[in-house]
Interface confidence: low
């Protein structure tokens, strides 16, 4: 029988009446157009909704927008369009919401053609009030808040000027011209690239990378011949053109660009690209595109300095620059990532790593599923997950995989069971152990979301027809109840719940359509009465993460330590609550070869934990570039995985001898870098 339809499923008592009392409809006095929704702050209950409607006239497009505000998680909305003087807001800039709980909001208005500059509306009280400010420039990008100080904003103008405000957009100053890309770093530092000659496009590969640490009073050129740059974790990356040809290489800095090292990654040609897939303070996942229009490349994982890289995964699917990759960080369990590879026969297969890229494997076939038509052997196949690539290919996949840090172990995704991703209509699968095992959760495509830190999962069927039914589960997707939230079905457009999965409210968005008109409508359902009581100690059970062999003393050891979590029992119907904190107990493991990656020039043969020398480098001295000097590497082939906390046990030694030779890098060495003040 389908999941949730067997006899073992107990029904939640009187849930229809409880939910009916907590279902709030809001019909927006709006023609349909488009709608965007933003949460302002964390646990504030404040939601801003911007609806826009374009009326194409013969000569121009006339636009109209409305702004609504809720302060009760979407149960009621108030039209606050008058607070922004009934101005048409530009949706391409979205609503710029300030970091943390600053309560700041910036809306960018549409202005008439001849105006001197743009116009913004600013609020610093969670959108209770707005101040109109005329800008001395036309913005090209959304206002970007400094992560450290929400009063500091930066923006690029349509004329490529870099503008900064120190008082939350009240006054603006152009601190540099001819800017291509600008990003906030740490400590209110701004990094940006500039062009000298024609334009960003014309100077690609000849850009300069600049830094200002005092909001534009003084500058330092920290790189030349730049193609692009990126920030990830504590790493600053730049791709730099080589002297002699059109190839470029990645350089990395961990000191805000004062010193640079050449990353031990392959160089790429004009048509190729690098992409930072994920980064934290320990390490980086870097994708390097293959030559030619292959649609795939190689994932490399870095050491703790971002300099020495190990090959992690071949034939990694990544279509084009800025294109699609399925690379997904499973945030509900440490060390877990899922992505897709393009196999030799051009089929797409899902791979998972549980140890931060150390080794990859196929996803285990769900117990309650049969292999589909893609499987050569009907008894042996894997689960393949639909993510960004499938969505871009317009497969019947309404949502990417979902996991939440505070819903430990839970991963929800669309998938198919076979030898490769299938083009057929997918089903929804759930893992409750971070991706080790999977179960079919729902038949056919659905939208889904996690509430109350995993205490409730909500889903809505993905249908072309109007809908009026929502499904929910209180036992991590084993059993499902259905609730008819309205008599009159709506064309469904999206599920919205507060980011962080701590809320117990879900908003169902859609529109009603009649012969003459269509209107936006939202239904907000509060599940608080379904989970009647607060969870107690007896509702939780101890769970060892990454456990694959309970007999083994080192069971659960990943990246040098194991973690025991307190997890809600599936049978407990209670509230984790908004203040729920994941309880975990770490313990250090003894080191084994699994705690070491293969060093530069070494690789791990399949199904072997030993690192062996790459044949093409056998007997060669290994040289690499560090802080502008050439280093000589003496190694037995191992290096500790960044973030690995193991102690004792196996301990392969690694030495680095300094040859004190200059690198053959064309990058500006620190002593050549120049500073200037405004």
């Amino acid at each position: 029988s389908a999941p949730g339809e067997d006899e073992e499923c107990g029904r939640v008592r009187d849930f229809v009446a409880k939910l009916a009392n907590n279902t709030h409809q809001h019909v927006f006095d709006d023609l349909r157009g488009s709608v965007s929704l933003s949460w302002v702050g964390d646990s504030t209950g404040v939601i801003l909704v911007l609806t826009t409607f374009h009326v194409p006239l013969v000569i121009m497009t006339f636009g109209q927008s409305k702004l609504y505000r809720s302060e009760d998680y979407g149960k009621n909305f108030k039209d606050i369009t008058d607070l922004i003087n009934n101005t048409f807001i530009r949706t391409e800039f979205g609503m710029a919401i300030g970091p943390e709980n600053s309560g700041k909001v910036v809306l960018t208005a549409e202005v008439s053609g001849g105006s001197r500059g743009g116009r913004i509306f600013r609020s610093s009280d969670f959108a209770k009030n707005f101040v109109q400010t005329d800008l001395p420039f036309h913005p090209l990008t959304q206002m970007m808040y400094s992560p450290q100080n929400s009063d500091y904003l930066l923006a690029l103008s349509t004329e490529n000027g870099l503008w900064v405000s120190k008082n939350f957009g009240g006054k603006w100053e152009e601190i540099h011209k001819a800017v291509c890309l600008a990003k906030w770093g740490s400590d209110n530092t701004i990094f940006f690239t500039t062009y000298a000659n024609g334009s960003c496009k014309a100077d690609l590969g000849a850009l300069e990378l600049w830094r200002t640490s005092d909001l534009g009073k003084s500058f330092k050129t920290i790189g030349v011949k730049i193609y692009s740059f990126g920030l990830g974790g504590r790493f600053l990356f730049a791709s730099v053109m080589a002297d002699k040809d059109t190839t470029r290489r990645i350089h990395v800095s961990t000191d805000q660009g004062d010193t640079w090292s050449m990353a031990q990654l392959p160089s790429v040609g004009q048509e190729q690209f690098y992409s930072i897939l994920a980064a934290n303070d320990d390490m980086v996942f870097m994708h390097v595109d293959e030559p030619g229009d292959t649609g795939f490349g190689t994932i490399f994982t870095s050491d703790d300095r971002g300099i020495v890289y190990s090959k992690s995964l071949d034939r990694h699917l990544y279509t084009t620059t800025g294109g699609e990759t399925d690379f997904t960080n499973v945030t509900s369990l440490r060390g877990v990532y899922i992505t897709s590879v393009l196999s030799e026969d051009n089929s797409i297969q899902t791979m998972i790593t549980f140890d931060q890229g150390g080794r990859w494997t196929h996803l285990r076939k769900p117990e309650n599923s049969e292999c589909d038509a893609t499987a050569k052997n009907k008894n042996e196949c894997s689960l393949h997950i639909h993510a960004s690539y499938s969505i871009s290919q317009k497969l019947n996949v309404p949502m990417a995989p979902l996991s939440e840090p505070n819903a430990v172990g839970i991963v929800i995704a669309h998938g198919s069971v076979g030898d490769a991703i299938s083009v057929m209509v997918p089903d929804v699968y759930i893992s409750d152990d971070g991706g080790y095992s999977w179960t079919k959760m729902l038949e056919g495509p659905h939208y889904y979301t996690i509430l109350d830190s995993g205490g409730i999962i909500v889903a809505i069927e993905h249908s072309s027809r109007p809908i009026n039914v929502i499904k929910f589960s209180t036992d991590e997707g084993q059993c499902w109840q259905t609730y008819t939230f309205t008599r009159d079905p709506i064309y469904f457009t999206g599920l919205a719940s507060e980011p962080g999965a701590r809320s117990m409210n879900i908003s169902i968005w859609g529109f009603t359509e009649s012969f003459l008109t269509s209107q936006w409508v939202s239904y907000t359902i509060d599940f608080k009465d379904i989970l009647e009581r607060n969870c107690e100690e007896k509702d939780y059970t101890i769970w060892l993460a990454h456990s694959t062999d309970p007999e083994d003393y080192e069971d659960g050891c990943i990246l040098g330590y194991k973690e025991q979590f307190l997890r809600l029992r599936k049978s407990s119907v209670c509230q984790n609550g908004r203040d729920y904190v994941v309880t975990k107990q770490p313990s250090i493991c003894l080191c084994s070869l699994e705690d070491f990656l293969c060093d530069f020039g070494y690789y791990r043969p399949e199904n072997d934990s030993k690192c062996v020398e790459q044949p093409e480098l056998k007997g060669h001295d290994l040289e690499f570039c560090l802080y502008g000097r050439e280093e000589h590497l003496t190694t037995n082939g191992y290096r500790k995985i960044p973030g690995d906390k193991c102690q004792g046990g196996v301990n392969p030694v690694r030495e680095v001898k300094d040859l004190k030779k200059k690198c053959t890098s064309n990058f500006l060495s620190p002593e050549k870098q120049n500073s200037k003040s405004n």
């Epitope: 019947n396 209509v425 249908s463 469904f492």
Partner: antibody, heavy 129, light 107 residues
Framework: QVQLVQSGAEVKKPGASVKVSCKAS????????MSWVRQAPGQGLEWMGI????????SYAQKFQGRVTMTRDTSTSTVYMELSSLRSEDTAVYYC??????????????????????WGQGTTVTVSS | EIVMTQSPATLSVSPGERATLSCRAS??????LAWYQQKPGQAPRLLIY???TRATGIPARFSGSGSGTEFTLTISSLQSEDFAVYYC?????????FGGGTKVEIK
């Protein structure tokens, strides 16, 4: 206008292979899947499989697994269907058909099946000793 | 695989009359269903997709209804050019499958 043009009729001996081509024009080749459907004389329609022109990934009906191979050449906007180990019951008209396969064009909400909206003229394959 | 069953196998109707064709799926196919018309010596032509939406250029006399397992194609007033074989096809789960067809002939 959008059209699919298939290769000409073939006569094959049992045990041989046949490769039918289908050239697409009038739309972005990589934006839609291509299905292959066959029809034996006096019989109904039978779906053989589908190919995604972007990556070349395929899904075949169980009945044809191991005997059919679908490929594509994006440079010429052409898909190919090769059927091996032919037997007399493979005598049929073979059609290629553009198949959105769940691709949403404009549906008010959600994606759903849009049907095989453009068909080739058909290729008659006769298997006879 | 999902089995599609069409009924009747043959339907004799006079021009101008209404024709109702049925298609049943062995399990739910939601609204992932299409109807095709095929005339002798021609390739099939898409009539209805998404169970109820007329394809481009298809006259309003053709309509589709149903969802789940029971579907109907209705031709409100048969014209001479409508006499043909009609097939339903599901695309809910692979492999795609067709019904055996209903032949609409002149009474």
């Amino acid at each position: 206008q959008v059209q699919l043009v298939q290769s000409g009729a073939e006569v094959k001996k049992p045990g041989a292979s046949v490769k039918v081509s289908c050239k697409a024009s009038g739309y972005t080749f990589t934006s839609r899947y291509m299905s292959w459907v066959r029809q034996a004389p006096g019989q109904g329609l039978e779906w053989m499989g589908i190919i995604n022109p972007v990556g070349g990934s395929t899904s075949y009906a169980q009945k044809f697994q191991g005997r059919v191979t679908m490929t594509r050449d994006t440079s010429t906007s052409t898909v190919y269907m090769e059927l091996s180990s032919l037997r007399s019951e493979d005598t049929a008209v073979y059609y290629c058909a553009r198949d959105p396969s769940g691709i949403a064009l404009a549906g008010p909400a959600g994606r759903y099946y849009y049907g095989m909206d453009v068909w080739g003229q058909g290729t008659t394959v006769t298997v006879s000793s | 695989e999902i089995v599609m069953t069409q009924s009747p196998a043959t339907l004799s109707v006079s021009p101008g009359e209404r024709a109702t064709l049925s298609c049943r799926a062995s399990q739910s196919v939601s609204s992932n269903l299409a109807w095709y018309q095929q005339k002798p010596g021609q390739a099939p032509r898409l009539l209805i997709y998404g169970a109820s939406t007329r394809a481009t250029g298809i006259p309003a006399r053709f309509s589709g209804s149903g969802s789940g397992t029971e579907f109907t194609l209705t031709i409100s007033s048969l014209q001479s050019e409508d006499f043909a074989v009609y097939y339903c096809q599901q695309a809910r789960l692979g492999p795609w499958t067709f019904g055996g067809g209903t032949k609409v002939e002149i009474k």
